[in-house]
Interface confidence: low
């Protein structure tokens, strides 16, 4: 098993039934406030629109959003913290017809309604303060 480079950027084609699976571990303890960020971009560029933005402030909160025409939309926040300090996690994002279903370590975590068509997602970027051991897209 080898580590993937972070930021990890991958070209994708998503549709209903697709699952994005991310396995990793926070680089530092939660006291040092590590973050995880996953962005579903509509182009192979970091400044493109984001259909789904998922950001973990480890030990604190999770924020979800979308970005259109360089403008962030209404932020959704969850204080539920399913990630464990120092522990490996498996984050799965299932593409359903009307929403993304986020799973953490096999447990349903949050449903985020589609704001931008899934068919427009061209790239997924995983980054910030994690080591990344797995990135997989299954259709």
């Amino acid at each position: 098993m080898s580590l993937l480079s972070v930021p990890h950027t991958e070209s994708v084609s998503l549709s209903t039934g697709s699952t994005v699976t991310i396995k990793g571990r926070p680089l530092v303890c939660f006291l040092n406030e590590p973050h995880l960020q996953v962005d579903f971009h509509t182009e192979m560029k970091e400044d493109s629109d984001i259909a789904f933005h998922f950001q973990v402030y480890f030990g604190n909160r999770v924020v979800m959003n979308s970005r259109e025409f360089k403008i962030w939309k209404e932020e959704v926040e969850s204080k539920n913290m399913p990630f464990q300090d120092g522990q490996e996690f498996e984050l799965s994002i299932l593409v359903l017809e009307d929403k993304y279903q986020v799973m953490v370590n096999g447990q349903a975590y949050y449903n985020f309604n589609h704001r931008i068509p899934v068919s427009s997602v061209k790239m997924v970027q995983v980054w910030r303060d994690i080591s990344l051991t797995k990135f997989n897209v299954s259709n």
Epitope: L3, L4, V6, P7, V28, C29
Partner: nanobody
Amino acid sequence: QVQLVESGGGLAQAGGSLRLSCVASGRAAGTYSMAWFRQAPGKEREFVAAITWAGGYTYGADSEKGRFTISRDNAKNTVYLQMNSLKPEDTAVYSCAGGRLFTSQSSAYQYWGQGTQVTVSS
């Protein structure tokens, strides 16, 4: 620009130990992830271990688990590789590398030392 200089290599007996050091100098040298790689004659470069800039997380090649330990002292801008229970197959040139990414992929590291030879005799 970051300069990396390794030391601590040499001849060791099988079952013995060596501690390699890598001193980093240059602007913001302490903010880079650091890694050790090795290359034996006629073989591909091989990942050994990596450590984050804060030293908060380390990662080692599965084959070396329990024998090799990477650590760092940012006050001295030095990264160490403690190698125990050495085997003849550990014979190689060991190089340290620095970069912004924390990974086992050698292509992600921008800065490299010249390397230090480790020879393990049976």
